[in-house]
C-alpha cells in the first residue's frame, strides 16, 4: 500500500530534495529557504533565487522550509514550574525544562509540569530521579510505599494493599488488642 500523501507533500515529491514546486507553475522547482528564514516570494523562474527573509525576533524556523511565516517562539510555563534552558533563536525554538532535583511529568504530549524528585525518606533510592521520571523508592521494614512516599505501617488500614507488606505489624497490633480484652 502506498501511504497517503497530502497535496503539499505530493507537490514537493516531484522536485528534488531541498526544492519545492512553485504554487502557480508546476514546471518550476524553487529552492527551499534555509532554517532561520521564511519564504517571502517564490522564485520567478527555473534556476532563479527564492526570496527568503530572516525570521523576526520572537519567531523561528528550525529546518529548511517554504513557510510564508516563521513560527512563534514557545514560552516556558511558569505556572507549571518550567524554566528556560535556552532562549529562542531564529533557527531554534525555546527549550524549557525543570530545575535541578526536579523531573517532568507530562500531562499530555506537549504539556509538562515540574515536580520535586522524591527523597525516599524512610527508604532507599532504587532508581535515581530522571529527566522524565521520579525517583523509585524502596521502603525500610515497617514502612510501605504510597504515592512514592514511604509511610509508616501504623497508617495501614486492613482494606488497603499495604496489608501484605505490613502484615507482621498488623498482627502485632491485633495481638495487643486481643490481649487487652481478656
Amino acid at each position: 500500500l502506498v501511504p497517503h500523501l497530502g497535496d503539499r507533500e505530493k507537490r514537493d515529491s516531484v522536485c528534488p530534495q531541498g526544492k519545492y514546486i512553485h504554487p502557480q507553475n508546476n514546471s518550476i522547482c524553487c529552492t527551499k529557504c534555509h532554517k532561520g528564514t521564511y519564504l517571502y516570494n517564490d522564485c520567478p523562474g527555473p534556476g532563479q533565487d527564492t526570496d527568503c527573509r530572516e525570521c523576526e525576533s520572537g519567531s523561528f524556523t528550525a529546518s529548511e522550509n517554504h513557510l510564508r511565516h516563521c513560527l512563534s517562539c514557545s514560552k516556558c510555563r511558569k505556572e507549571m514550574g518550567q524554566v528556560e534552558i535556552s532562549s529562542c533563536t531564529v533557527d531554534r525554538d525555546t527549550v524549557c525544562g525543570c530545575r535541578k532535583n526536579q523531573y517532568r511529568h507530562y500531562w499530555s504530549e506537549n504539556l509538562f509540569q515540574c515536580f520535586n524528585c522524591s527523597l525516599c525518606l524512610n527508604g532507599t533510592v532504587h532508581l535515581s530521579c530522571q529527566e522524565k521520571q521520579n525517583t523509585v523508592c524502596t521502603c525500610h521494614a515497617g514502612f510501605f510505599l504510597r504515592e512514592n512516599e514511604c509511610v509508616s505501617c501504623s497508617n495501614c488500614k486492613k482494606s488497603l494493599e499495604c496489608t501484605k507488606l505490613c502484615l507482621p505489624q498488623i498482627e502485632n497490633v491485633k495481638g495487643t488488642e486481643d490481649s487487652g480484652t481478656t
Epitope: R77, K78, E79, H105, W107, Q113, F115, N116, E147, N148
Partner: nanobody, 119 residues
Framework: EVQLLESGGGLVQPGGSLRLSCAAS????????MVWVRQAPGKGLEWVSH????????YYADSVKGRFTISRDNSKNTLYLQMNSLRAEDTAVYYC????????????WGQGTLVTVSS
C-alpha cells in the same frame, strides 16, 4: 467540606456554543492552578485547559485551541470554560479539578457535566 460543582453542560448542535461553570467551596480557590479535563466515551482523560491563580497564564490543548476560553473569577470562587464552534469530537464528560502542587494528581475533582454535540 470541599466541593467542585460543574454546570452548563447539555446537548448542542455542531457549531454551537456552551459555557461551563465550576463553583468551588471548602478550600482557598484563589491559590493555585485550576484545570478542565474531559473524558470522551470509551477514552482516557484529556487535559483540556488550565489557568493559573491570577488568571494571566492559560493553556489549551491543540484540539480546542482558538475555540475554547478558560477564565476564573476568584471573588466568586468560580471557574469557567467558554466553548465555541463545538464539534462532535468534543462530546465528553467535562470535569474541573485542582491539580496538586507537590506531585502528579489532583487535590479535588468535580462530579462532571456531560456535553453532547450532535445534530
Amino acid at each position: 467540606e470541599v466541593q467542585l460543582l460543574e454546570s452548563g453542560g447539555g446537548l448542542v448542535q455542531p457549531g454551537g456554543s456552551l459555557r461551563l461553570s465550576c463553583a468551588a467551596s471548602g478550600f482557598t480557590f484563589g491559590n493555585g492552578n485550576m484545570v478542565w479535563v474531559r473524558q470522551a466515551p470509551g477514552k482516557g482523560l484529556e487535559w483540556v485547559s488550565h489557568i493559573d491563580e491570577y488568571g494571566t497564564n492559560t493553556y489549551y490543548a491543540d484540539s480546542v485551541k482558538g475555540r475554547f476560553t478558560i477564565s476564573r473569577d476568584n471573588s466568586k470562587n468560580t471557574l469557567y470554560l467558554q466553548m465555541n464552534s463545538l464539534r462532535a469530537e468534543d462530546t465528553a464528560v467535562y470535569y474541573c479539578a485542582k491539580p496538586r502542587n507537590d506531585r502528579p494528581g489532583f487535590d479535588y475533582w468535580g462530579q462532571g457535566t456531560l456535553v453532547t454535540v450532535s445534530s
